[in-house]
Interface confidence: medium
């Protein structure tokens, strides 16, 4: 595959892996809770998120209360806000360092540092990524310890809810496109040195493997 | 069939500036970018500078000073402009063909043209 | 500004033969290492790019080999329409540059 390819792919991979993080940050279900006991006989199911509790009625209405204090919130609530929404918006950043490195856009010049350029939003998607998976590893363990802690009552015990299973797929996402954009500007085209200095200017795009691509000519 | 030609004046006063063309067929200006290469009688190429696909230059910093490098994508034509010429100037002049990559190469040539600087 | 050492200068050989051509970069450069053919009163022709691809159009006893600061190119079996100045070039970092060249003479 060339690396021009590998660039698309790579950013389409990254872009869906943002859009599930961003799901993943903003639903409700980081875990959840069902009991049938004699005092919530109305109650299915209980999720809890990052910005808000709902409560699922046996009618299927779902009632939400966004969280009103910060400071209320427990810490790896307050944790994994901070590094999710930290990991969407190095995402936006590196969304504009990798169209600015990709080979078929035109803001930086086609040659040694424009590859740099690639690289480094295939690496801060990469880190996006690793970033992302601290709070949902982090919560999957409190909910996982929790709910084979004999000392935690069974009204008190959460299970694993789908916005970290999307969260999960979100930075798998997010590292494989990070990988496959490094691969376009180091692999494929000459590897450059990461720690070498870039010394020039740049103005502008390119065709890395297109020795005679046709869409270059008339 | 991809085509570069160089034209110019052959002959060339000390202290005057140069001035050549390089047309291109078979290639858009507006997709493909085209580097300058010199080369003096006897001895080995000297990368200029080039002009990239979005109108964008580099030079060799070698030449910086007193060179530029422009375009007429209407017309095909690259143009090469030389102040200060001295003695040690003369050379080949070659455009090329510089594919939009990451690490430029040059794959299509013109046949050159003889600038001699003397009085 | 990156050097490239060629070596050696001139090389004679007899048709038949395979000879490597040597090119040393003054510093790491990876695979970004491009060959180059120049007969008599000619324009330069490109042989290999990125050190080992191979150009469509040339000879296949033409190769290139190398990563990091050396490169080779390879002619098996050389023929008399081989005798030409070879270059190499990187494209590291700007300014690019070309090495001074290896001559091939045919004994």
């Known amino acids: 595959m060339g690396s021009a390819a590998l660039e698309i792919l790579g950013l389409v991979l990254c872009l869906v892996g943002w859009g599930g993080l961003i799901l993943a940050c903003a639903l409700p279900q980081w875990r959840i809770y069902s009991y049938a006991g004699d005092n919530i006989v109305t109650a299915q199911a209980m999720y809890e998120g990052l910005w808000m509790s709902c409560v699922v009625q046996s009618t299927g209405h779902m009632q939400c209360k966004v969280y009103d204090s910060v400071l209320a919130l427990s810490t790896e609530v307050q944790a994994a806000r901070a590094l999710t929404v930290s990991a969407v918006l190095l995402a936006f950043v590196a969304l504009f360092v990798t169209l600015a490195g990709a080979q078929c856009t035109t803001c930086v010049a086609p040659g040694p540092a424009k590859a740099r350029v690639a690289l480094t939003g295939g690496v801060l998607y990469l880190f996006c990524g690793l970033l992302a998976l601290v709070p949902l590893c982090w919560f999957a363990n409190i909910v996982v310890r929790e709910f084979y802690d004999p000392s935690v009552p069974v009204s008190q015990k959460y299970e694993l809810g789908a916005a970290l299973y999307i969260g999960w797929a979100a930075t798998a996402l997010l590292m494989v496109g990070g990988c496959l954009l490094c691969c376009g500007a180091w692999v494929c085209t000459g590897r450059p040195d990461l720690s070498f200095p870039v010394k020039y200017s740049a103005p502008r795009r390119p065709t890395a493997t297109g020795d005679y691509d046709k869409k270059n000519y008339v | 069939q991809v085509q570069l030609k160089e034209s110019g004046p052959g002959l060339v006063q000390p202290s005057q500036t140069l001035s050549l063309t390089c047309t291109v067929s078979?290639?858009?200006?507006?997709?493909?970018?085209v580097s300058w290469i010199r080369q003096p009688p006897g001895k080995g190429l000297e990368w200029m500078g080039v002009?990239?696909?979005?109108?964008?230059?580099e030079y060799n910093s070698t030449v910086k000073s007193r060179l530029s490098i422009s375009r007429d994508t209407s017309k095909n034509q690259v143009f090469l402009k030389m102040n200060s010429l001295q003695t040690e100037d003369s050379a080949m002049f070659f455009c090329?063909?510089?594919?939009?990559?990451?690490?430029?190469?040059?794959?299509?040539w013109g046949q050159g043209v003889m600038v001699t600087v003397s009085s | 500004d990156i050097v490239l050492t060629q070596s050696p200068a001139t090389l004679s050989v007899t048709p038949g033969e395979s000879v490597s051509l040597s090119c040393r970069a003054s510093?790491?450069?990876?695979?970004?290492i491009h060959w180059y053919q120049q007969k008599s009163n000619e324009s330069p022709r490109l042989l290999i790019r990125?050190?080992?691809q191979s150009i469509s159009r040339i000879p296949s006893r033409f190769s290139g080999s190398g990563s990091g600061t050396d490169f080779t190119l390879t002619i098996n079996g050389v023929e008399s329409e081989d005798l030409s100045v070879y270059y190499c070039?990187?494209?590291?970092?700007?300014?690019?540059?070309f090495g001074s060249g290896t001559k091939l003479e045919i004994k």
């Open positions: 090329a063909r510089t594919p939009d990559g990451y690490y430029p190469y040059f794959d299509y």
């Open positions: 078979g290639l858009s200006l507006i997709r493909n970018s």
């Open positions: 002009i990239w696909s979005n109108g964008g230059t």
């Open positions: 510093q790491g450069i990876s695979t970004s």
């Open positions: 990125y050190a080992s």
């Open positions: 070039q990187q494209s590291y970092n700007l300014p690019l540059t």
